[in-house]
Each structure stands twice: as C-alpha cells, then as structure tokens.
C-alpha cells in the first residue's frame, strides 16, 4: 500500500489509475469510488463486472495490464478511487488510494474594468479578469506589452497607470488550470483610458 | 516493448525428444505466466499449458502430461518446451504466449513460432 | 474439457461488409472468451479479451459481446487488412484453455 496518488483529468479526456502487482495468484481486484463499487476483476476466471452498465465502455485495461483507465471524463468523477488486490498468498490485500480531479477546458476569461481617475493626464484603474461559469483552481496572469520591456504581473487583479503621451500599451489576462490555459482578448490602453476620459463610471470590457 | 523470440525449425526422428526455447524481453518475466500453444498444419489451436517462471509452477492440459514439460530460467528470461517421445501428430507449429495480466488464460503477446516436423 | 463451437468455418464477404462469427461454449463460461486473428504464416492476434473488452491498438470496428455459452465476434465494416481466420478461446477459471475451429474469412 503506497502515498495516495494524485491524478488530473480534463472533461471529455481519460486517465489512467497506474496499479502493478507481482503477486502470482491474484483472486480479486475491486475498484470503488467515493466508497461505491466500480469494477470487480477475477483474472483467473477471467471475468470483469463494472458494476453500473452506463460505465461499462468508459473502463479499459490499458495492455491488458491491472492499471484502470476511465475516459468520457465527467466533472463529478472527481474524488477518491481506491483499488484493492485480494490474494489468497497475501495476508492483508494490497491497496492503494487515488485521488482524481476533473478540470474543465477553460473558455476565454472575461475583463472587467474600475473605476477610473484622470488626473495631471495620467490615466489610473484597475482591470480584472475572471471566468464566467467560476471554474476552480484557475490562475491569473497578466502581461503587459509594449514598453520599452514586456511585463507580468500575477493575480486576477491589474491596476494601470498610463500617462497619456507614452506609447500604447495592450493588456492580456492568461487564464490557467492543471489542463488548459486560454487568453483574453487584448486591451488596448489608449482605447481604454479614452473610453474611461469620456465615462468617469466603471466600463466593461 | 515486449518480444518473444523462439529457437528455430527442427526435424526430429519418431521417439526422439526436442526442446523449443522462448527468450522474453520487454517486460517482467518472472511476473507473468508463459503459455504453450500448438498448431499443427492446417489446423486450429491447440493450448497445451503454461508456467510461471517466477516460481516454475507449470499447468498442464491433460492431454500433454507426459508428453510436454515446462520450464523456465529466470537468469535468462527464457522458457523452455521439451517434447518427448515423439510421434508424427505431433508435426506442429509451437507458439510460446504470454497471458494478460487482467486475464490469464487470454494472450496478448506470442512467439514467431517454431515448426517441428517428425519424420521417418 | 469445455468445448468451444465456432461458426461459420469459413465465408465470403466484400470491404464493407458487417460480418458476426459465433461461439458457442459446451458449458457456462461467464464472460471469459477472447477472440484472436491470424493471418497465413503468422502467430494470433489478441482482439478481445473477456468477452469485450478490446486489446490496446484493435480497431473499433471489432466488437465482442456475449456472456454465459454464447458469444458473438463482429466485424462492423470489413476492411482488407481483416481477411484472415478468427479463432475464439475460452480463459474461464482452471486450464485447460482451449479454442473453437476457427472461422476464415475470405474475399467474395
């Protein structure tokens, strides 16, 4: 029995729950998730029951090896798998515990912008990125181009202060997960701050 | 990845004895059970047992104890057919096959074979 | 022994074509059948191992199906590459393992 495995899935995609035995005379191998039954495998007699039918062409055996594969990935097969091997030459049966996260491929995340102040031709507010339908454990980065040297900057939040005169500068927000990444579209600063010099109320972008 | 090579052709006397090696690489061989299947001209497949190199533990058809014996040198990677007492019938090609883990008895990787012809 | 009883031994069909090969066992073997194709000169090939589940790499026009003593392999569209014999096996529980006759499947 092995540390708990963490593995990432994207929704549509497969994984793979990697299990090895070298045991000779396996009886049983029984899989469960979040505590209800998945597969029964008898590699002696050959058989292999996955216990709800709508499952049955979502489970393979990669090489015919005892690793589980589960495609057609689903957000809410995210949880904990757990696989034991039953031997009659083992005193206690070999397990091991997963713990599988489903993500969704991101969309293109959403720009929202402050309130904005012009003063002495200094043009100051804050963008902020976020994604529509709250997916989880996304990242935010910005990058900044189009000054004398590019920039990042992390979190959802970027506050700007563009002096009217400078060169023009686009704003991007890269939105990432553990299995995708997708960008905003560009943000122009002068179209920005001319916008906001027009309206002193919050825009959207 | 996973290969199964096997000695060559062989032309044996009735009565004589042959033994047909199988050299394993690309996986565990002591791990996996190694089956012995025949096919003589023409004809369908025969299963005539298998063992487990880890320990030599060896299953037999009924049909060839006696007349096949199994081994297995895990040094080598290699399992060994030998064949005794031979007659005519038993003119085949002989595959060494490597079961699944997931299922036993089916086999996913096989020998390029091995003809043995016993002739007067 | 558990006899394994292929049919047809042989048949005709053109790419394309949907093709069904039966099994039939002598007694209960659950779900513990594997199908294998081969080709002239050349060792089987795993399709389909308990009853149907596909082998790594087998194309998707392979389907085996099945349980108890009666067991179907198909071919959903017959392409060149799978004119060869198909033989059946049954894996159930304690050896002997054994196969049906064979089914060759030839070129109308």
């Known amino acids: 029995s092995g540390p708990v495995k963490e593995l990432v899935g994207s929704v549509g995609g497969a994984v793979t729950f990697p299990l090895k035995s070298k045991v000779k005379q396996v009886d049983s191998i029984v899989w469960t998730f979040n505590t209800t039954p998945l597969v029964t495998i008898q590699p002696e007699g050959g058989t292999i029951i996955v216990t709800q039918n709508r499952n049955r062409e979502r489970v393979d055996f990669p090489d015919g090896g005892y690793s589980l594969k589960l495609s057609k990935l689903k957000k809410n097969d995210s949880g904990i798998y757990y696989v034991g091997i039953y031997s009659s030459s083992l005193q206690q049966p070999s397990t091991q515990e997963y713990v599988l996260h489903v993500y969704e491929h991101l969309s293109k995340p959403k720009v929202t912008m402050g309130l904005q102040s012009n003063k002495n031709g200094t043009c100051v507010t804050n963008l902020t990125c976020c994604m529509e339908h709250g997916e989880e454990d996304v990242i935010y980065t910005w990058k900044a181009l189009g000054q004398a040297a590019n920039e990042s900057h992390n979190g959802s939040i970027l506050p700007i202060s563009w002096r009217w005169g400078e060169s023009d500068m686009t704003f991007i927000c890269v939105a990432r997960n553990p299995v995708s990444r997708n960008f905003s579209s560009p943000i122009l600063a002068r179209k920005l701050c001319e916008g906001a010099a027009d309206d002193p109320d919050s825009s959207m972008v | 990845q996973v290969q199964l090579v096997q000695s060559g052709a062989e032309v044996k006397k009735p009565g004589a004895s042959v033994k047909v090696s199988c050299k394993a690489s690309?996986?565990?061989?002591?791990?996996?059970?190694m089956n012995w299947v025949r096919q003589a001209p023409g004809q369908g497949l025969e299963w005539i047992g298998r063992?487990?190199?880890?320990?030599?533990?060896?299953k037999y058809n009924g049909k060839f104890k006696g007349k096949a014996t199994l081994t297995a040198d895990k040094s080598t990677s290699t399992a060994y057919m030998e064949l005794s007492s031979l007659r005519s019938e038993d003119t085949a090609v002989y595959y060494c096959?490597?079961?699944?883990?997931?299922?036993?008895?089916?086999?996913?990787?096989w020998g390029q074979g091995t003809l043995v012809t016993v002739s007067s | 022994d558990i006899q394994m009883t292929q049919s047809p031994s042989s048949l005709s069909a053109s790419v394309g074509d949907r093709v069904t090969i039966t099994c039939k066992a002598s007694q209960d073997v659950s779900t513990a059948v594997a199908w294998y194709q081969q080709k002239p000169g050349k060792a089987p090939k795993l399709l389909i191992y308990s009853a149907s589940y596909r082998y790594t790499g087998v194309p998707d026009r392979f389907t085996g199906s099945g349980s108890g003593t009666d067991f179907t392999l198909t071919i959903s569209s017959l392409q060149p590459e799978d004119f060869a014999t198909y033989y059946c096996?049954?894996?159930?529980?304690?050896?002997?393992?054994?196969f049906g006759g064979g089914t060759k499947v030839e070129i109308k």
């Open positions: 096996q049954q894996h159930y529980s304690t050896p002997p393992y054994t």
């Open positions: 690309g996986y565990a061989f002591s791990s996996s059970w």
């Open positions: 096959a490597r079961s699944t883990m997931i299922a036993t008895g089916a086999m996913d990787y």
């Open positions: 063992i487990y190199p880890g320990d030599g533990d060896a």
